[in-house]
Amino acid sequence: LMGGQDKPFLSARPSTVVPRGGHVALQCHYRRGFNNFMLYKEDRSHVPIFHGRIFQESFIMGPVTPAHAGTYRCRGSRPHSLTGWSAPSNPLVIMVTGNHRKPSLLAHPGPLLKSGETVILQCWSDVMFEHFFLHREGISEDPSRLVGQIHDGVSKANFSIGPLMPVLAGTYRCYGSVPHSPYQLSAPSDPLDIVITGLYEKPSLSAQPGPTVQAGENVTLSCSSWSSYDIYHLSREGEAHERRLRAVPKVNRTFQADFPLGPATHGGTYRCFGSFRALPCVWSNSSDPLLVSVTGNPSSSWPSPTEPSSKSGICRHLH
């Protein structure tokens, strides 16, 4: 990661993708340390305060404007050299978001995937974006970039992610950029949580008072395991949102969550998954499906199947 013998390494924390009005810390790592450095922008636009200024350890930039977008380099202090400064660092591209209307982000076949599978994340917009960028929350690397394809007044790009492993799980957002302003990005798409299942042993799912109940009777689904899961997720076939609850240790040394469904109106097939707080987007194998049947209610309506949505903050910690 570090630069060559006389080349510093310039990096951004927390990310090279910065919302308009936000702040970012630029660090110039030179010769095993963060020393004094100079910073400059390749296109020389804006940032007059860089000229002739020396920064110590890190430079906090912001509140950022579209004019901050661009390529930066630094030079580390080298007192005994001819110029007093190192060779220029690697180029660091800072992208500023919030400059155009947000695009949409979809997952195909869906956002809940098994380890080893591949998912296509499609970013699209009716704004004629030249490039699309895909960024995963919490990582400081540059986002993936693809050229937008334009068909029928819609620009879109398909990002292939996989084979999926735990490190690829998380919250994704995409952005668009227009020609001539490649680093001035749109507002972010709504977040899309990509969840990887099948990494840990399956929990068991049971119903109280039982899987077959009278209409109007209260039903509770219990998800439990010997594994010390922190959170359980309950999904219903054909329903867009999962429910989640914190796991509670029981006297028999299992970890359990009880999901009250309330008075039964119509049945359905349920599954549950376990996950750990440290990796909220990495789930266990699915429990065996549990079919809950409701009797005495012939007119019950079944919801139409929809693609499971992961826009409810699955990948955030449950506090």
Epitope: H23, P48, I49
Partner: antibody, heavy 118, light 107 residues
Framework: QIQLVQSGSELKKPGASVKVSCKAS????????MQWVQKTPGKGLEWIGW????????KYAEDFKGRFAFSLDTSASTAYLQISSLKAEDTAVYFC???????????WGQGTSVTVSS | DIVMTQSHKFLSASVGDRVTFTCKAS??????VAWYQQKPGQSPKLLIY???TRHTGVPDRFSGSGSGTDYTLTISSVQAEDVAVYYC?????????FGGGTKLEIK
């Protein structure tokens, strides 16, 4: 939303010390710095200096070097201004404000009144 | 140190008027000028930075312009809630310095 909450008013005797706190919320504390500004009826708004919350490196305006010191508790998202050997002319309202190397102060604390009187 | 001068201590306007605050720097500050509003009993609030960039949530009746040493803040249609002291600040070189402020009063 971004908020900076400062500690309450202080009444001190000359020669004493005071420590003003500024607790930040609503953003990642270490991605920005904390600026400190003094407001007096005579001189208006004066920049005391700032501390880089990412590196912990402070920078002081020439007129405030010596008795003024900045510190951080990043785990509590809190910045501190300590003034030692207080003088009557330190009587002022002290503001913390979020900002970085570019000197723009985008969110301000409510201010802490420090009165130095014997 | 760069001195920022706001020549008017007071400005008076009626609701709906257009009002302009001026600020002069003792040297070229290369558009690195911010404007703050301080209402009675409150802390300053950022309105404009880099001469003309409006801060989040600031109404578009506030605008800034200028270059070199001369900068202005304009309120296109003054509202009663705009009663405050307005400060300019240069963020070109440390120490950052503020103007003495201009108090806006409503007639």
């Amino acid at each position: 939303q971004i908020q900076l909450v400062q500690s309450g008013s202080e009444l001190k005797k000359p020669g004493a010390s005071v420590k003003v706190s500024c607790k930040a919320s609503g953003y990642t504390f270490t991605t920005a710095g904390m600026q400190w500004v003094q407001k007096t009826p005579g001189k208006g708004l004066e920049w005391i200096g700032w501390i880089n919350s990412h590196s912990g490196v402070p920078k002081y305006a020439e007129d405030f070097k010596g008795r003024f010191a900045f510190s951080l508790d990043t785990s509590a998202s809190t910045a501190y201004l300590q003034i030692s050997s207080l003088k009557a002319e330190d009587t002022a309202v002290y503001f913390c404000a979020r900002g970085g190397d570019e000197g723009v102060m985008d969110y301000w604390g409510q201010g802490t009144s420090v009165t130095v009187s014997s | 140190d760069i001195v920022m001068t706001q020549s008017h201590k007071f400005l008076s306007a009626s609701v709906g008027d257009r009002v302009t605050f001026t600020c002069k720097a003792s040297q070229d500050v290369s558009t690195a000028v911010a404007w703050y509003q301080q209402k009675p009993g409150q802390s300053p609030k950022l309105l404009i930075y880099w001469t003309s960039t409006r801060h989040t949530g600031v109404p578009d009746r506030f605008s800034g312009s200028g270059s070199g040493t001369d900068y202005t803040l304009t309120i296109s249609s003054v509202q009663a809630e705009d009663v405050a002291v307005y400060y300019c600040q240069q963020h070109y070189s440390t120490p950052w310095t503020f103007g003495g402020g201009t108090k806006l009063e409503i007639k």
